[in-house]
């Protein structure tokens, strides 16, 4: 089991990358002047206490920025948020911190990220682009939930 976060770059099937804008992650087309964030991911060390068949439970952080992705309810709806958090602090906790955990599932070159706290809700980007990352239950419709990961370094 890795004990260091793995830096990755993420883009969707429409070649849009994740960019940090006013503390919000948005998906934009890759261009010369766009500087995508590097995502850090690390597997939960309590994997034996989480469901085995949904993917690899991981924490997702923004490399070097002390920000992590988490899911929280806003009214009735789970929302995707960035919280100031050291990914290693999450990793070392005595129990899985479910609000910050995602099941990473890979099929060929495509990856999905399903919220552990809200099963059935996936990280997604609107098909229009230039929009914030969201959580959705609607797979393969107006939102893209399939992403490509490239390991860095």
């Amino acid at each position: 089991k890795s004990e260091m976060p793995q830096p990755v770059s993420i883009q969707d099937i429409n070649h849009r990358v994740w960019v940090l804008q006013d503390q919000i992650l948005i998906a934009v087309p890759r261009k010369d002047r766009v500087s995508p964030v590097t995502i850090s991911l690390i597997s939960c060390r309590h994997v034996e206490t989480l469901e085995k068949d949904r993917g690899n439970p991981i924490y997702l952080g923004l490399n070097g920025l002390n920000l992590c992705l988490m899911c929280a309810k806003a009214g009735d709806q789970p929302t995707l948020q960035l919280k100031e958090k050291d990914i290693m602090d999450l990793y070392n906790q005595p129990e899985p911190v479910k609000s910050f955990l995602f099941y990473h599932s890979q099929s060929g070159r495509n990856s999905t990220f399903e919220s552990v706290a809200f099963p059935g809700w996936f990280i997604a980007v609107s098909s229009e682009g230039g929009c914030p990352l969201i959580l959705t239950q609607e797979l393969g419709k107006a939102n893209t939930t399939d992403f490509g990961l490239t390991m860095l370094f």
Epitope: T49, E51, K85, N92, Q93, P94, E95, V97, K98, A117
Partner: antibody
Framework: EVQLQQSGAELVEPGASVKLSCTAS????????INWVKQRPEQGLEWIGR????????RYAPKFQGKATITSDTSSNTAYLQLSSLTSEDAAVYSC??????????????WGQGTTLTVSS | QAVVTQESALTTSPGETVTLTCRSS?????????ANWVQEKPDHLFTGLIG???NRAPGVPARFSGSLIGDKAALTITGAQTEDEAIYFC?????????FGGGTKLTVL
Amino acid sequence: EVQLQQSGAELVEPGASVKLSCTASGFNIKDTYINWVKQRPEQGLEWIGRIDPANGYTRYAPKFQGKATITSDTSSNTAYLQLSSLTSEDAAVYSCSTLNYYGSSFFFDFWGQGTTLTVSS
Amino acid sequence: QAVVTQESALTTSPGETVTLTCRSSTGAVTTSNYANWVQEKPDHLFTGLIGGTNNRAPGVPARFSGSLIGDKAALTITGAQTEDEAIYFCALWYSNHWVFGGGTKLTVL
């Protein structure tokens, strides 16, 4: 209001089994970890184990493996502690507690009122 | 299994500062033990006070603080009040299970 309501006192014969309950109100047990602890007079607290009601996975203290079984029923928002092959050593007050993450830490935050188990023939 | 040791009893006066400690049989207590402190009042009324060594639970008065002092976890009550008379338990995390201490009976008179 968040509450953990535990079942009433039990008087059980040696060698038998008992199942204690802990019913939550004011929150969904799937959103927390439910822990069980044992307390005997003048002996402090002993952590027995915990369950994640969202998936049923459990952890136990080494001492209680084989003695205790923790289960949950999300439809009734209840966690259970079953103790088997009871002896006088198992006579104690058993309490349930939630373990929740706030901000940057886990806390044993909400507690049941305890269930007294007496083992006697 | 590790043994967690606390002072069996301490006495303080209202307004005074008192520190309770929590020692591990396996060596120095560190932040990786995620020390928790829990208060017990009569009739098995428990309240979680501190988690992760030094973080106060929501709603817990600021006079309660957690820290590491030397090789032990510590709970300090700054300006003790009569209602703080209780038994205080620490719990330490050891890789995959918690171990509670025997408790400290704090008398405030």
